[in-house]
């Protein structure tokens, strides 16, 4: 008994395709070893047609593939364009010849079925319309016209001239004649079902003078789409249903035992599992739509099936398009945490990843919202202003060339939780979904600046502390000048060499800023936080006013912000650091400048891809002027 | 509501033939896939046949221990499908089980590969 299985009787009809399933034991050998599709010659011989090891004889040639999944220990051999010299005995098997493990298959391609000479044949899709043209001669322009569909006995009238209309075809079936045409008249049958596939006759006038024609009606159901996907990257389901449903509520739905579970329509229905990953998208008039997922699950694969009804629901009848979608395990996506925890007023920093082969590319954050059809308006981007509500909060740093950049945000609110997308103008199979959660803060922040209302006086020096625990003793301490293209790190130097120290005092770890002399360009945010490598990790925000010396003058706090600016107890682990390069302004900051919106997310590669450094940096900071002392007591 | 239902099954003599069939009702779409599994008492449920419908090829499978004594049949469009069974003998005793689908993804072989399931009609050899 051969440990290979699969179809054993195989039928076609010419100018069709098959696709042969071959199942194969579940072992590393198998999973890495040569399939091949071989047809046996009478003298037991069998003779390579297509193998895994990229082979394809002449008469396969531009016709036939042979993919293997081995996530699903199949391979499958897609075979169009038959004809009946296909027919024959073949074998589907695995191992370096053709005389390893193998199972026989017999493939039988028929001639498309004979009908009626003047049989006009019509293939239509599940759901679609079909109009029949029906000619007849003059002298049967008074006579009754009339369709009827042949069962085993009879034929079943469908329409007439006489407005009779059989039961199942009410409201579907219209017989019409065309302006002064008087030699032809039309049945149109909408929302095709199985039921209606068949023979049909056209007649008019009645007895052996009549006008008849053999129709054959073909109602196909659309053949799935098959989409291989890996494990947390995102999928695009691109819906094309037709002008006729253009005006019609749109799904995707998902087969289930004994209905398809909609995902998501556009009447503001979601199902919670894509809660955070989902978003359906009108493209155009022309009925079409798409539906993106991200962050794929293994749980997310199966059969998903897209269509259009007043109900927003699968209707019979109803134009569909389905695929089958499955997740490959083996994911050349990282594995990161899919919830990151923060707290109030605290800070977490996000680890995106992007495919390492387009470190060029633009990256974006964004802040997934459900509401109406599901949308992402872009907050930060690599060449995209922050949003104006996270000014001084929010900040993007790329590190081209190793996979990942990281967001961070901080001054944290309960408001900030949610879901929040990385994605890129790139490979958009590297969209991932992060779900931020924010719990009211129960203990003092990590990171501490002083003094809190900080207003430093032109020309002066100021100095600014930031406070933090021994647990990020050996970590490096930064300070960095925020401005809506991101955060540019201070340059730094320590006041003398580390020494190794056995006890840490809690009390007296600082790094401290200082502006010397302060300048106007010094007023705005700046941010404490500790990083190691590329590792971001906490963050701590404070606004400093920049104001002229006035007699008796007394520092007014410019915001209450700074009194927030207080640090998440976890942080996200990341690999990435700062681009120091200073960024020029960008005038026309895309791919979301207008709305700042992911509305078209498929249709990514059109955008304006603006010039300029990724990595933020303020043209304005003066660093000479900007000394960054670590002082350790 | 989805129903498969089974018929034919019957006592019969070793090396005669049976027909079963299996009509499935309630559904809105055609199915793609439709098999029979049998149980003979105290074992697991096994394979029998299947056949697979795609646009208008057809896919029959069938376990070593049938090939060439059953066969398979259907239409997909009326959602119905035989079992033509030949040269029966004591071993091919049980419960004959109607599975079906509506698309053709997974091992044919595994009973989690269909969604619908019949009652099962029982087919009794006799020496």
């Known amino acids: 008994k051969s440990p290979i299985f699969g179809p054993q009787e195989v039928s076609s009809i010419e100018g069709d395709s098959v696709s042969i399933t071959c199942y194969y034991p579940d072992t590393s050998v198998n999973r890495h070893t040569r399939k091949y599709w071989c047809r046996q010659g009478a003298s037991g011989m069998c003779t390579t047609l297509i193998s895994s090891n990229g082979y394809l004889s002449k008469e396969y040639s531009g016709r036939a593939n042979l993919i293997n999944f081995p996530e699903n220990n199949t391979f499958v051999i897609n075979i169009e364009q038959l004809t009946q010299d296909d027919t024959g005995s073949y074998k589907c098997g695995l191992g370096t010849s053709n005389r390893g493990l193998s199972f026989d298959v017999s493939l039988e391609v028929s001639q498309v079925p004979e009908l009626p000479s003047d049989t006009h044949v019509y293939t239509k899709d599940i759901g679609r319309n079909v109009t029949i043209e029906c000619p007849f001669k003059r002298e049967n322009a008074p006579s009754k016209k009339s369709l009827c569909k042949k069962t085993n006995q009879s034929c079943e009238l469908v329409i007439d001239s006489t407005e009779k209309v059989n039961p199942s075809y009410i409201g579907r079936a219209k017989l019409f004649m065309k302006g002064t045409d008087l030699t032809v008249f039309y049945v149109n049958i909408s929302h095709l079902t199985h039921n209606d596939a068949g023979l049909y006759i056209c007649q008019a006038g009645e007895g052996p003078s009549a006008d008849k024609k053999n129709v054959d009606l073909q109602v196909l159901a659309p053949e799935p789409e098959l989409l291989y996907k890996d494990l947390r990257s995102s999928v695009t389901f691109e819906c094309d249903l037709g002008r006729e449903v253009a005006n019609e509520a749109k799904y995707l739905c998902r087969m289930n035992k004994e209905t398809c579970d909609v995902i998501i329509n556009t009447l503001g229905k979601r199902d919670p599992d894509f809660e955070g990953r989902i978003l359906i998208t009108p493209k155009d008039d022309n009925g079409r739509f798409s539906v993106l997922i991200t962050g794929l699950r293994k749980e997310d694969a199966g059969h998903y099936q897209c269509g259009a009804h007043s109900s927003g629901l699968p209707q019979e009848g109803w134009p569909i398009q389905t695929w089958q979608l499955f997740v490959n395990e083996e994911s050349t996506i990282p594995n990161r945490r899919s919830v990151v925890k923060g707290v109030t007023g605290g800070s977490v920093a996000i680890a995106c990843p992007y495919n390492p082969k387009e470190s060029s590319s633009l990256k974006y954050w964004c802040r997934w919202e459900g509401d109406g059809n599901g949308h992402c308006p872009v907050l930060v981007g690599t060449q995209a202003q922050v949003q104006e509500e996270y000014e001084g909060r929010l900040a993007l740093f790329d590190q081209p060339g190793n996979g990942t950049y990281t967001v961070i945000l901080n001054q944290l609110t309960t408001e900030d939780a949610g879901f929040y997308w990385c994605l890129t103008n790139g490979d958009s199979r590297w969209r991932t979904t992060i779900e931020l959660q924010v719990a009211e803060a129960t203990r003092e922040p990590n990171l501490e600046v002083t003094p809190q209302n900080a207003t430093a006086v032109l020309g002066e020096t100021f100095t600014v502390s930031c406070h933090y625990p021994c647990k990020f003793y050996s970590q490096e301490k930064y300070w960095c000048k925020w401005s809506n293209k991101g955060c540019h790190i201070l340059p730094s130097h320590d006041e003398g060499a580390r020494q190794s120290s056995v006890s840490c005092d809690q009390s007296s770890q600082l790094v401290s800023m200082t502006l010397n002399p302060v300048s106007k360009e010094d007023e705005g945010w700046y941010w404490c936080g500790v990083k190691q490598g590329q590792t971001y990790g906490e963050t701590t925000a404070i606004y400093i006013a920049v104001e002229e010396r006035t007699r008796g003058s007394s520092h007014v706090n410019p915001t209450d912000a700074n009194a927030r600016a207080k640090v998440a107890l976890e942080e996200e682990v990341v690999d990435s650091s700062i681009s120091e390069k200073e960024n020029k302004a960008i005038p026309n900051p895309g791919p979301f400048a207008n709305e700042r919106e992911i509305q078209n997310v498929g249709d990514q590669a059109q955008e304006n891809r603006a010039s300029g450094d990724a990595g933020s940096a303020d043209g304005q900071s003066r660093s000479s002027s900007s000394k960054h002392h670590h002082h350790h007591h | 509501e989805v129903q498969l239902v089974e018929s034919g099954g019957g006592v019969v003599q070793a090396e005669d033939s049976l027909r079963l069939s299996c009509a499935a009702s309630?559904?809105?779409?055609?199915?793609?896939?439709m098999g029979w599994f049998r149980q003979a008492p105290g074992k697991e449920r096994e394979f029998v046949a299947t056949i697979e419908w795609s646009g208008r090829s057809t896919y029959k499978y069938y376990d070593d221990s049938v090939k060439g004594r059953f066969a398979v049949s259907g239409d997909n469009t009326k959602n119905t499908m035989n079992l033509q069974m030949k040269g029966l003998n004591l071993e091919d005793t049980g419960v004959y089980y109607c599975?079906?689908?509506?698309?053709?993804?997974?091992?044919?072989?595994?009973?989690?590969?269909?969604?619908?399931w019949g009652q099962g009609t029982q087919v009794t050899v006799s020496s």
């Open positions: 599975a079906a689908n509506p698309n053709n993804y997974g091992d044919p072989r595994t009973p989690g590969a269909y969604q619908y």
């Open positions: 309630g559904l809105s779409f055609s199915l793609s896939r």
